[in-house]
Interface confidence: medium
């Protein structure tokens, strides 16, 4: 599923050809139906202010690589979503790079700040992973690891709209070291603060840190799953949590290996390999159908690690919702 979005080729990071990331590969978006509402959501996701235009992606150099795929045929946002991933999308079926979508957001001068509050994750793969930097008096500063905690990371991830914080031992690699002044250390967050600037900290600019102590944070969308409608937590219709919304999973390609991963993830033992009839006794779901064509090897620890179509892409009805029965 798309895990990142960026604008490429513009003079600043808030304008350019739209590219999305899927399985580590960046691809473009076809401009079918692409309009100012879609750009508004994209600008919001990137922290680039209001939408100012829907220029063609073809305008921006260098052009998309020939081997680079067009990943999305069309995007349809209402304009209120926080991310493109929350908008209705169609998988690509017929689009060339001459039809790549572009976007332009307002205020390039302040476009290097992903959110108004002035915090960003720099030099990472996308805006939800990277070195923590905070803006103070129009200057970006790095944050020292001394006193940093997962609670502080939670605040940053929430502030950036990037989901939950991931516990990571990753340090800033040499080429990602900061070159800016070191802002502060001894961050003391409870985890409930709205912004990192709300957390108590040591004095501004007064520390003995160096840049190999810069803080690295990684966030990811919350992912969870559950079985509903059964007699216990280990049987029922499968629902997955994505972007804060529960939705069902289509049974196309679903089989024993997929069952096993779900049971394993839930700590529910092994799959009882229910019959088609048994699977149908939990009834159809309502709302979003999040996943389709899920393919697991059986070795995965989480359904999230299995291959599947883009989130929200499917050709299913709720009559095809997957149900799973585990040994408990």
């Amino acid at each position: 599923s798309p895990s990142g979005v960026r604008l490429v080729g513009g003079l600043h990071r808030c304008e350019g050809r739209v590219e999305v990331e899927q399985k580590g590969q960046w691809g473009t978006v076809c401009d079918d139906g692409w309009d100012i509402k879609d750009v508004a959501v994209l600008c919001r996701e990137l922290g680039c202010g209001a939408a100012s235009g829907t220029p063609s992606g073809i305008l921006y150099e260098p052009p998309a690589e020939k081997e680079q795929k067009v990943l999305i045929q069309s995007v349809s946002c209402t304009g209120t979503e926080d991310t493109l991933a929350q908008c209705e999308q169609e998988e690509v079926y017929d689009c060339s790079h001459d039809e790549d979508a572009g976007a332009s957001c307002e205020n390039p001068e302040s476009s290097f700040s992903p959110v108004p509050e002035g915090v960003r994750l720099a030099d990472g793969p996308g805006h939800c992973k990277g070195r923590v930097e905070v803006k103070h008096q129009n200057q970006w500063y790095t944050v020292c690891q001394t006193g940093w905690s997962l609670r502080a990371a939670k605040v940053v991830c929430r502030q950036l709209g990037c989901g939950r914080a991931v516990l990571t031992q990753k340090r800033c690699n040499k080429h990602a070291y900061g070159r800016k002044p070191i802002w502060l250390s001894q961050m003391s967050c409870s985890g409930r603060e709205a912004t990192l600037q709300d957390c108590p900290s040591g004095p501004w600019g007064k520390n003995t840190c160096n840049h190999d102590e810069d803080t690295w944070v990684e966030c990811e969308d919350p992912f969870d799953l559950r079985l509903v409608g059964g007699d216990n937590l280990c049987s029922g219709r499968l629902e997955v949590l994505h972007k804060g919304v529960w939705g069902s999973v289509c049974d196309d390609n679903w089989g024993e290996k997929e069952d096993q991963v779900v049971c394993k993830q839930l700590g529910c033992g092994k799959s009882l390999s229910p019959s088609f009839r048994d699977r149908k006794c939990y009834g159809p779901g309502v709302g979003r159908i999040w996943l389709d064509n899920v393919r697991c090897s059986g070795e995965e620890q989480s359904l999230e690690q299995c291959q599947h179509r883009f989130w929200g892409f499917h050709d299913c009805t709720h009559q095809e919702d997957v149900a799973v029965i585990c040994s408990g």
Epitope: G10, S56, L59, P63, P108
Partner: antibody, heavy 116, light 108 residues
Amino acid sequence: QSLEESGGRLVTPGGSLTLTCTVSGIDLSSYTMGWVRQAPGKGLEWIGVIAINGGTVYASWAKGRFTISKTSTTVDLKMTSPTPEDTATYFCARGAGKTWSSFNLWGQGTLVTISS
Amino acid sequence: ELVLTQTPASVSEPVGGTVTIKCQASQSIGSNLAWYQQKPGQPPKLLIYRASTLESGVPSRFSGSGSGTEFTLTISDLECADAATYYCQSYYGSSTNAFGGGTEVVVK
């Protein structure tokens, strides 16, 4: 290779007017095309461009007031509710390629006068 | 919106002289700047693009330099035919397409 603008005339404020740029010897699927205007005795003013796939970009002041469209041989500029300040010579221009670029071929321009 | 400020507004130099016109951008535009020459009653003519690349057919007496926010057009060995108004133009991005106010060059 040439560009020729037409449609310029005297229009009353609040009316609507479409200018047409007819291209000769130019494949519009290979070039970004733009419109620029020049009020009498004044400097050049960038209005907007249309990309090879029909996507348009306008100057902030021109959004909602101008619409650029094209066929295989023409590029149109539609003006809605013009005011006397829109009185100018309107030039059609060809970009140097598919991307944002300078304009390396210009039409002679067509004069639009907005007056009651 | 980007603003391009051209100086001077007018300059007068004798035949054989040199004219220097400056163009300052309100934000960095890399090398995405062009220079045009316009004579009365005619459309503009592209002289230089990408800040310093001479358009085909333009005499080498015209040269451009600069990048970022500061750009210069230099006309050396001035000829009578160089009398015209010169404009700079930035041309990259939705909010960065603009023309400078123009510089009138008078050849004495």
